[in-house]
Interface confidence: low
């Protein structure tokens, strides 16, 4: 277990031309506050996943009042740092997400009272216990001057929080094996209490006796990569000979969210849904008032007013979620009928419908055939929204005005030749081939594949194509 | 100083439609929304509805859509209520109010008093 | 559509006393209250925003506190001056609602 925490040291504009203009106005005053978002490994997931190492926010900075015709300046931050705690091992390999929000303090009307001001994405390697990184990332015409540090919380210690230390037993020195925890040196690493062969690099315990694996590792010892490429069961623990996840319980099995929070698989572990008051990986961070701002995306946040009372995130259209961080995915239900482009503009739902289809939906079929004549005897038929003429034979194109030219496909097989007819097409087959396309071989001794030759036609006789 | 200056008094025939005025002066005009407040009988106040003069937000209370129509013009800083086909239970005295704090009204216009008879 | 209620309707008050005006939501609106008063023939002023934040120039003699449904205005010392309707107003949710508001009147 430990905590990763992160100081933001300035947000402004960049260097170079085109400095942005200030967030605040005269008459608009604002304040910043920041969110980060933590997820194992090198991933490149989008923003909207889960934060599943956790997440923090920001206190509200000073109240910010543009003076007018000054450049944007640094702009006053929040005290104190982000903090986000883990209970788990430290993976070693994390990407953060760091979003710069403005709380606007004037009217919006048509908009949110908040909005996202800059967001900067990063993957990372850090060990637990080192020092401050130090970082400056660049979103826009906006830059971001931060650090961050993992550390671990007592007794944990170790590059992964891993390792526990207890105060010493005797003064002088550790017992047989055990190595001082430097750099406290007047702790001693405890014994080793994980399952026997546990693997020291993949599995860690938190318990006497119990194996944990890291990402991308399953077994009992927690010595098998987990490959998902040739398996047809989603979830773990894997048969040690392979590799390949075998049925077995899953990872909402026991139900590891905290405080009521309820728990779904997703395609790589699981997620909890945390009743108001509790956020973080297990729901097991609580406190939270509304002057910690926990409505994202420009939810409304009441209640709560201090730690006892649960607050309430009143969400905007297209957001949902305790904390309304989940967009909302409306086209996902395929509002749009007749193959109609959903577009989700977040304060409603369009469609964009295909020709011949239209209303809100695309759920009216324009009548395609009205006023259209098809000539020379050909009938319209309506059809995915486009009209189209089924023509007489000997005409074609699109309203059937053009005579067609039954040859012009090549209709006959095997070298047989072309004649235009008053009626269609007739084919005079090469020498060894019959039928109304000469798609039938003559056998050598005379008689034909199937079909027969019709009676008073004999093999090689020019078929007319009726 | 911030002001807003409403139009004058009218008196119209039921069935009428009447624009209301609100011309603003002293601030940045596309930087604070501009609403519209009934008060009938010297009493309580109603809620007509709301623009945003920057983005052209536009918000109307249930009661009012089709009665009110809200405009801008921000070449004049000027924000325009159109209200149609009036009846005797329009007659009232109509404020614009602008809202720096959100949806506070920090500043309201005089009033204009609107009678419909015939 | 939130109702906000207000009472009383009216009441009598001699300069220098305390009085103490309510407000209460049909439902929570957190913070998002704003207290106006409206002298005769005049349009309403901004006392009291975000329940209680006293607008620029109030005199500090006005008070505004509650959240979620209850909310009230109180006045330290009433003076001369402070005759008039008093109107709460939420803005929570669209459409605004304001209060049937409180005739303040001197004894």
């Known amino acids: 277990a430990g905590v990763f925490e992160l100081q933001i040291h300035s947000f402004g504009p960049g260097p170079g031309p085109g400095a942005p203009r200030s967030p605040c106005s005269a008459r608009l005053p604002c304040r910043l506050f920041f969110r980060v978002c933590l997820k194992p490994g090198l991933s490149e997931e989008a923003a909207e996943s889960p934060c599943a190492l956790g997440a923090a926010l920001s206190a509200r900075g000073p109240v910010y009042t543009e003076q007018p015709g000054a450049p944007a300046p640094d702009l006053p931050l929040p005290d104190g740092l982000l903090q986000v705690p883990f209970r788990d091992a430290w993976p070693g390999t994390f990407s953060f997400i760091i979003e710069t929000w403005r709380e606007e303090l004037g009217d919006q009307i048509g908009g949110p009272a908040w909005s996202l001001l800059a967001r900067v994405a990063g993957r990372r390697r850090l060990a637990a216990g080192g020092p401050w990184a130090r970082d400056i990332q660049r979103a826009g015409a906006w830059e971001l001057r931060f650090s961050y540090r993992a550390r671990c919380e007592p007794p944990a210690v170790g590059t992964a929080c891993t390792r526990l230390c207890r105060p010493r037993s005797a003064p002088s020195r550790c017992g047989p094996g055990l190595r001082p925890c430097a750099p406290l040196e007047d702790e001693c690493e405890a014994p080793l209490v994980c399952r026997a062969g546990c693997s020291p690099e993949h599995g860690f315990c938190e318990q006497p006796g119990e194996c944990r694996c890291l990402e991308g590792w399953t077994g009992p010892l927690c010595t098998v990569p987990v490959s998902t490429s040739s398996c047809l069961s989603p979830r773990g623990p894997s048969s040690a000979t392979t590799g390949c996840l075998v049925p077995g319980p899953g990872p909402c099995d026991g139900n590891p969210c905290a405080n009521g929070g309820s728990c779904s698989e997703t395609p790589r572990s699981f997620e909890c849904t945390c009743p108001r008051g509790f956020y973080g990986l297990r729901c097991e961070v609580s406190g939270v008032t509304c002057a910690d701002g926990p409505c994202f995306n420009g939810g409304l946040c009441v209640g709560g007013a201090d730690p006892d009372s649960a607050y309430i995130c009143h969400c905007p259209p297209g957001f949902q979620g305790s904390n309304c961080e989940k967009r909302v995915d409306r086209c996902s239900l395929q509002p749009c009928r007749n193959g109609g482009l959903c577009l989700d503009l977040g304060h409603a739902l369009r469609c964009r419908c295909r020709a011949g289809f239209a209303g809100p939906r695309c759920e009216h079929d324009l009548d395609d055939c009205a006023g259209r004549a098809c000539a020379n005897g050909g009938t319209c038929v309506e059809g995915g929204g486009a009209h189209r003429c089924s023509c007489a034979l000997g005409f074609g194109g699109r309203d059937c005005r053009e005579r067609a030219d039954p040859c012009a496909a090549r209709p006959c097989a095997h070298g047989g030749r072309c004649y235009a007819h008053f009626s269609g097409l007739v084919c005079a087959c090469a020498p060894g081939y019959m039928g109304a396309r000469c798609e039938f071989p003559v056998h050598p001794d005379g008689a034909s594949a199937l079909p027969a030759a019709p009676p008073g036609l004999r093999p090689g006789d020019p078929q007319r194509y009726l | 100083e911030v002001q807003l200056q409403q139009s004058g008094p009218e008196l119209v025939k039921p069935g009428a439609s009447v624009k209301i005025s609100c011309k603003t002066s002293?601030?940045?005009?596309?930087?604070?929304?501009m609403h519209w407040v009934k008060q009938s009988h010297g009493k309580s106040l109603e809620w007509i509805g709301g623009?945003?003069?920057?983005?052209?937000?536009?918000s109307y209370s249930q009661k009012f859509k089709g009665k009110a129509t809200l405009t801008v013009d921000k070449s004049s800083s000027t924000a325009y209520m159109e209200l149609r086909s009036l009846t005797s239970e329009d007659s009232a005295v109509y404020y614009c109010?602008?809202?720096?704090?959100?949806?506070?009204?920090?500043?309201w216009g005089q009033g204009t008093t609107l009678t419909v008879s015939s | 559509n939130i109702v906000m209620t207000q009472s009383p309707e009216s009441m009598s008050m001699s300069v220098g006393e305390r009085v103490t005006l309510s407000c209460k939501a049909s439902e929570n609106v957190g913070t998002y209250v704003s207290w106006y008063q409206q002298k005769p023939d005049q349009s309403p002023k901004l006392l009291i925003y975000?329940?209680?934040n006293r607008y620029t120039g109030v005199p500090d003699r006005f008070t505004g506190s509650g959240s979620a449904t209850h909310f009230t205005l109180t006045i330290s010392s009433v003076q001369a001056e402070d005759l008039a309707d008093y109107h709460c107003?939420?803005?929570?949710?669209?459409?605004?609602?304001f209060g049937a508001g409180t005739k303040l009147e001197l004894k």
């Open positions: 002293g601030y940045t005009f596309t930087e604070s929304a």
């Open positions: 975000g329940a209680s």
């Open positions: 109010g602008s809202s720096y704090y959100r949806d506070y009204f920090d500043y």
């Open positions: 107003g939420q803005s929570y949710s669209y459409p605004l609602t």
């Open positions: 623009i945003n003069p920057n983005n052209g937000g536009i």
